[in-house]
């Protein structure tokens, strides 16, 4: 059995040149003719040189999975899906996203250090001592309130709560 070159495919005991991206094999090569290729029909594609008898079906971006169509399928390129706003891609296969997750909401005591994008989750960071955050989409931790001379500190601030002051 012959070992075919990188851009050839085996037919019986013969090696045939592959079809170009955007095409599939219509007729395998013979003694006098090379591989006869045919363009991929609508909603199908081949992204690489190939020996496929049929083009691959274009991917569909499922809104129920949090996906939207970012780039339409062409004869040589699969559909590119992106996550809807507020979501990021959990499973990426090359340029194709299959599932999205909602961006993390930062918990109390943390702030948003880096906003989430279509392909990255939100990055949260702890509030420094002397500051607090209720969490959510807050990008800055707020400084604790300093009780005035006429007030008494009832409860010291934490990373998630402000100082509690009482009027005398």
């Amino acid at each position: 059995q012959p070992s075919c070159r990188q851009e050839e495919f085996l037919v019986g005991d013969e090696c045939c040149p592959m079809c170009n991206p955007g095409y599939h094999v219509k007729q395998v090569c013979s003694e006098h003719t090379g591989t006869v290729c045919a363009p991929c029909p609508p909603q199908t594609y081949t992204a690489h040189a190939n020996g496929l008898s049929k083009c691959l079906p274009c991917g569909v971006c499922d809104p129920d999975m949090g996906l939207l169509t970012w780039q339409e399928c062409s004869s040589w390129k699969d559909t590119v899906c992106r996550c809807i706003p507020g979501y990021f891609c959990e499973n990426q296969d090359g340029s194709h996203c299959s599932t999205c997750l909602q961006h993390t909401t930062c918990p109390p005591g943390q702030r948003v250090e880096k906003r989430g994008t279509h392909d990255q989750d939100t990055v949260c960071a702890d509030c420094l001592t002397g500051t607090f955050s209720l969490g959510g989409t807050q990008e800055e931790c707020l400084p604790w309130t300093n009780c005035s001379a006429f007030q008494q500190e009832v409860r010291r601030g934490t990373n998630s709560t402000d100082t509690t002051c009482s009027s005398q």
Epitope: R5, Q6, E7, E8, C15, C16, P17, M18, C19, N20, Y23, C29, H32, T33, G34, T35, V36, C37, A49
Partner: antibody, heavy 115, light 108 residues
Amino acid sequence: EVQLLESGGGLVQPGGSLRLSCAASGFTFSSYAMSWVRQAPGKGLEWVSEISQSGSSNYNPSLKSRFTISRDNSKNTLYLQMNSLRAEDTAVYYCATGRWRFDYWGQGTLVTVSS
Amino acid sequence: EIVLTQSPGTLSLSPGERATLSCRASRSVGKYLAWYQQKPGQAPRLLIYGASTRATGIPDRFSGSGSGTDFTLTISRLEPEDFAVYYCQQYGSSPPVTFGQGTKVEIK
């Protein structure tokens, strides 16, 4: 003796149309796939289109559906309808026997696209 | 599409000398490569197909070799009528068939 004689070339304005013909003789025309190949002045060869014996056709993707190949086996004639012509379509257009390799060629007809 | 690159662009030789023309494909075309000769003001003429088979009526001083991506056209002893432009063409994966940019063989 195989003979292929192209006609229909000439001067046409950008956006215009032309229909080229290729009269074949000396062989059983209906048994052969046929092709058009063009050559811009001073440049190399570029495959344009081919048509099988039964009439199914293929085109160079770069032509963006502006050209249509057809044949009339009863008249032993091959045609190329060219629409929305551009300056870059200026070339000698050859008809040739065969689909993928070209055993016999006509002498060509010159198409000039210019305003 | 498959790109064919011919070298050299021009070959300056004398009658009686040996000419070696090269054609390289951007990916494998198997043995499905043809060579054509074109003289000024004339249509191309098929010389070689299937990388190494001479077309009808072509003298045996013309020979072709190679497979995959590297091909050679050899003219063993140049005759005055051999000075012309030579094109390679692949039909390994088509459409589209593609041609090389040509090699001009000129008299030195």
